[in-house]
């Protein structure tokens, strides 16, 4: 029928499977006047055929491992075959069927592997080749390790890529590998074609044997380091070495110290490079890297620490240049006058801190000497003799030495001696009544003003007032403020007020004195007064039970699941509705009721995270008043980008004639999270027909180098498939092309005819 | 066998017109294009079209556009030419041949007629 | 208009003795299918044109062996080896790659 099998001349693409013999026509091309016939060329191979009046076939079975693709133009010829239409592209594409087996590159691998290397990290690549297809199953490989030898207590110590032949050890056998245990290990791999999914796959296997060597790649023991070292620097504190000569060493400070005292040289040595001070840092922890040629890590890396020892290099200190003490003329003996604390910066609880307290003068010394004494380790100053007289001697004057192990201070004190507290502080109101506020009155308000008098001496601790609140405000909603001049108390607000917890508080103040009251008088009646606070109702917005909420979900969660909730009560007791704002991507939805968020789309980290939206909750009924708080998704990363090409690779060119085999780099990327090792992915050719013409050989986890395996091309562009798996969980392989041109040169570039000038290479090789 | 025969020389004054036949046998032909070529006493062969009798479609030399017109009668196998508005400078021996469709080969060629175009 | 030239007006040869001629073209007679769409026509004194060779290097049908065609996609030879009497006459070169089909101006081949 017209369409299908039969029409005009046009651009069209066939797919024909390989290894079937002819059993139909391709296509029947229909000719407008003046054509007349129809004329083939291309990659016809003997193959393809275009009878006269445009029936398009093919004579024999195609073979995709000879050629994948044919590239055909049909062109109309008049009567006089001069071409009137056309040609036209025609492009068979030839269908992989599995006619090929797997085969390895080698029948025997030997590789090493160094204990406690990280689990999952390649340490030898097996590779195997099917001429098949690698887009379809019939070229996807399937690794296996059949058996392990030997194999202690059934545990796998080894563990292989199925996609990618990486062999790494197992969590397992990154622990337990000992090379002084068993040196030696044989392992028995098979590969399979068709994914290893059906039993009409092809296989074959290899052998692999694998040395276990030592690994010296560990973090050395805590350093101690004293402080203030006069030895010249830098000092040899301690080292790392890596399992092989030529590592990068470096060293990472995860704290971006202003200054950071550590090296490394390039054995791996570690110096400390100038003094240390205990008392501007007390401990390092930082970081050794090894890395290889390519700036690239080779392990993960060692944490080392450095603790740095006390010497007693800082006298003690004292709390002011004069600690004022007060003392009432009837003290006891015995009594505490106050305590002097003084300081010391060096090492708490060790010697070089330990203090010493001593009075070594009195002035003046009336009505004689030592009339104080001193606690020696705790500085409490205590009356040591008699009861002091105002009117003889109002003010003592203390030097005090205080002394660690190597330092002595002297620190000074003042007592004054102050009348007997024998009067209490009476209130001028007993009751200030009712106070009716909002509950929405802002904090730091005053909302009273309370006044209590006390005749002992003034300005002094026996006259002094200070007023608590003693009943009635057990949420500390409440504060009162005092004038030292006037001793006037001002009640302010400290915290919100509340009517749905406290509509009415029945208020006690208390006035009390800093001194203590002489043996015999007692605070009464006239030390408190009340007050009522009627606190009236305003509509309050919800409130969040937290400011920012933070939930924390792998970006691959199936949609539907939840992912965090918010919850939010109204002072009012009002039901609460929720809802989300700002999910500028749509990947959330809120439960209204509940508050609970689930993810309404796939997620995606390399979109960004955390994932910031805002929740909402809003009154139901009432004056639908709302609230906002923050709802951060965080999300952690899985393996869902495949690698690529880390920039463009256009322009790539060889001279030609090659006069050697040539080589150039190339780097790959993907956007993955990597943290600190960084990527660590394999490249191989895209297709087994590469193979002939050139060969992918790994740098290091990101870098590759594409070389020629012989010099005989032809001044073309090839188009080169690598394929470059990033060895995650799952393993994602990416297939890119690398445009490779070979074109005659002038003073090493690419030599283009004048009108040619499109696209011209610019890398030379 | 196949021939190609042409009518014989004409003798037409300036400003007339003519036209010469080629009958055709030994083959089918609407299967096959007919070409013109002219010759002047003592010149080179100058190509001035052909037709292709199955779908009557012709191709002109721009140089012989308005002067020649190619036309082919099936029922009896013979093409056509005709010669407009004719000077001296047209006068010439003209050619038919044959070019075998598929292989493209100008095999077969008539024996030419003379036309001489005085006053 | 691809232009055919034949330099040469005439050729003297003596019978028995090889001889070439030769023809160029403005542009490339080569196709895409790897033909070479050049024709090779003797013209006998007072006789119609007669087809020796076709797309560049093939031999017509009853042509002797004598006669061959070669070239490149401008420049092109026809070799005639053993000249005889009867091969006299004018030899053109002919494209037929696009309209208008143009001929060389015709080399000449005279016995001495």
């Known amino acids: 029928q017209e369409g299908k099998f039969s029409g005009p001349l046009k651009p069209m693409t066939f797919s024909i499977y390989e290894g079937q013999e002819p059993s139909q026509i391709i296509f029947q091309f229909k000719a407008n006047p003046p054509a007349v016939t129809f004329e083939l060329t291309g990659e016809t191979d003997n193959i393809f055929v275009i009878e006269r009046e445009g029936l398009l076939y093919y004579n024999r079975a195609l073979d995709r491992e000879t050629r994948s693709t044919h590239n055909l133009q049909v062109a109309a010829l008049d009567a006089n075959g001069i071409i009137v239409e056309g040609p036209v592209p025609i492009t068979i594409k030839v269908k992989d069927i599995n006619d090929n087996r797997p085969t390895f590159l080698q029948s025997k691998y030997e590789g090493s592997v160094r204990q406690n290397s990280r689990p999952g990290k390649p340490f030898l690549y097996v590779n195997a080749t099917d001429l098949d297809d690698p887009a379809t199953p019939n070229g996807q490989l399937y690794y296996q390790i059949v058996i392990q030898l030997p194999m202690i207590n059934n545990v796998m110590y080894f563990q292989i890529n199925n996609k990618t032949g990486a062999i790494s050890l197992t969590r397992e056998g990154s622990q337990e590998l000992n090379p002084a245990k068993n040196p030696s290990y044989n392992l028995v791999i098979s590969v399979k074609d068709m994914g290893g999914q059906s039993e009409n796959s092809f296989s074959d296997t290899t052998s692999v044997d694998i040395i276990v060597t030592e690994n010296i790649w560990k973090a050395p023991k805590p350093v101690e380091m004293v402080e203030n070292s006069t030895d010249p620097h830098p000092i040899k504190i301690t080292q790392v070495r890596w399992n092989d000569p030529g590592a990068q060493y470096s060293l990472v400070d995860k704290e971006k110290l202003p200054r950071f005292p550590f090296s490394i040289d390039q054995e791996g040595d570690i110096y400390v490079t100038q003094p240390l001070d205990r008392e501007e840092k007390d401990a390092y922890v930082f970081y050794a890297v090894a890395k290889d040629e390519y700036g690239k890590p080779l392990s993960y890396p060692l944490e080392i620490h450095v603790k740095v020892k006390d010497i007693n290099d800082n006298p003690p200190t004292c709390p002011s240049p004069v600690t004022v003490f007060e003392v009432q003329e009837n003290e006891r003996l015995g009594n505490s006058i106050g305590t002097l604390t003084a300081h010391d910066r060096d090492e708490e609880n060790t010697a070089n801190s330990f203090l010493n307290y001593r009075i070594v003068e009195q002035t003046p010394k009336l009505p004689m000497d030592g009339l104080f004494l001193i606690q020696t380790y705790a500085g409490m100053l205590q009356l040591a003799k008699q009861s002091l007289k105002k009117q003889d001697t109002p003010q003592y004057n203390l030097t005090i030495e205080v002394s660690d192990k190597d330092f002595k201070t002297l620190c000074f004190v003042q007592i004054n001696v102050i009348d007997i507290n024998d009067q209490i502080p009476i209130f001028e109101k007993s009751d200030y009544g009712n106070l009716t506020l909002a509950e929405d009155t802002n904090i730091g308000s005053t909302i009273l003003t309370i006044q209590a008098t006390d005749a002992d001496e003034p300005f002094t601790g026996s006259s002094k007032i200070l007023y608590h609140i003693i009943k009635g405000d057990s949420e500390g909603r409440l504060g009162v403020d005092t004038d030292p001049h006037t001793n006037t108390g001002y009640v302010i607000i400290k915290k919100p007020l509340d009517f749905e917890t406290a509509a009415v508080s029945n208020i006690v103040f208390k006035a009390e004195n800093p001194e203590p009251l002489v043996f015999g008088v007692k605070y009464n009646a006239s030390s408190f007064a009340k007050f009522t606070l009627i606190v009236t109702d305003v509509n309050e917005a919800p409130q969040f039970s937290q400011h920012v909420f933070q939930a924390k979900v792998s970006e691959d969660v199936a949609i539907g699941t939840k992912v965090g909730n918010v919850t939010a009560k109204d002072p009012e007791g009002l039901d609460i509705s929720y809802s989300l704002r700002g999910d500028t991507r749509g990947w959330l939805k809120i439960d209204h009721v509940t508050g609970e968020i689930f993810s309404v789309a796939p997620l995606d980290r390399e979109a960004g995270s955390p994932y910031r939206v805002q929740v909402v909750a809003t009154e139901v009924g009432g004056s639908s008043l709302s609230s906002v708080s923050e709802f951060h998704l965080i999300l952690m990363d899985v393996n869902d980008n495949p690698p690529r090409l880390a920039k463009d690779y256009t322009g790539l060119f060889f001279c030609h004639p090659l006069s050697a085999p040539g080589s150039l780099i190339f780097e790959a990327t993907d956007d993955d999270q990597h943290l600190f090792r960084g990527p660590h992915f394999t490249f191989s050719l895209g297709s087994g027909s590469l193979q002939n013409d050139w060969e992918v050989s790994k740098i290091n986890g990101t870098h590759a180098r594409l070389s020629t395996r012989h010099t005989e091309f032809e001044e073309r562009e090839y188009v080169v498939l690598i394929r470059i798996n990033d060895g995650g969980r799952p393993p994602l392989e990416g297939i890119v092309s690398l445009p490779v041109t070979f074109c005659s040169c002038v003073e090493g570039s690419c030599f283009r005819p004048a009108g040619h000038q499109t696209g011209i290479p610019t890398v030379g090789m | 066998q196949v021939q190609l025969q042409q009518s014989d020389a004409e003798l037409v004054k300036p400003g007339a017109s003519v036209k010469i036949s080629c009958k055709v046998s030994?083959?089918?032909?609407?299967?096959?294009?007919i070409h013109w070529m002219s010759q002047r006493p003592g010149q080179g062969l100058k190509w001035i079209g052909y037709i292709y009798p199955r779908h009557g479609t012709t191709n002109y030399n721009e140089n012989f556009k308005g002067k020649a017109t190619l036309t082919a009668d099936t029922s009896s196998s013979t093409a056509y030419m005709q010669l407009n508005s004719l000077t001296s400078e047209d006068s010439a021996v003209y050619f038919c041949a044959r070019m075998r469709n598929y292989f493209y080969v100008m095999d077969y060629w008539g024996q030419g007629t003379s036309v001489t175009v005085s006053s | 208009d691809i232009v055919m030239t034949q330099a040469a007006p005439s050729v003297p040869v003596t019978p028995g003795e090889s001889v070439s001629i030769s023809c160029t073209s403005s542009?490339?007679?080569?196709?895409?299918?790897?033909?070479?769409?050049l024709y090779w026509f003797l013209q006998r004194p007072g006789q119609s044109p007669q087809l020796l060779i076709y797309r560049m290097s093939n031999l017509a049908s009853g042509v002797p062996d004598r006669f061959s065609g070669s070239g490149s996609g401008t420049a092109f030879t026809l070799r005639i080896s053993r000249v005889e009497a009867e091969d006299v006459g004018v030899y053109y070169c002919m494209q037929h790659l696009e309209y208008p089909f143009t001929f060389g101006s015709g080399t000449k081949l005279e016995i001495k």
């Open positions: 030994g083959y089918t032909f609407s299967d096959h294009a």
């Open positions: 542009k490339s007679l080569l196709r895409s299918n790897g033909n070479t769409y």
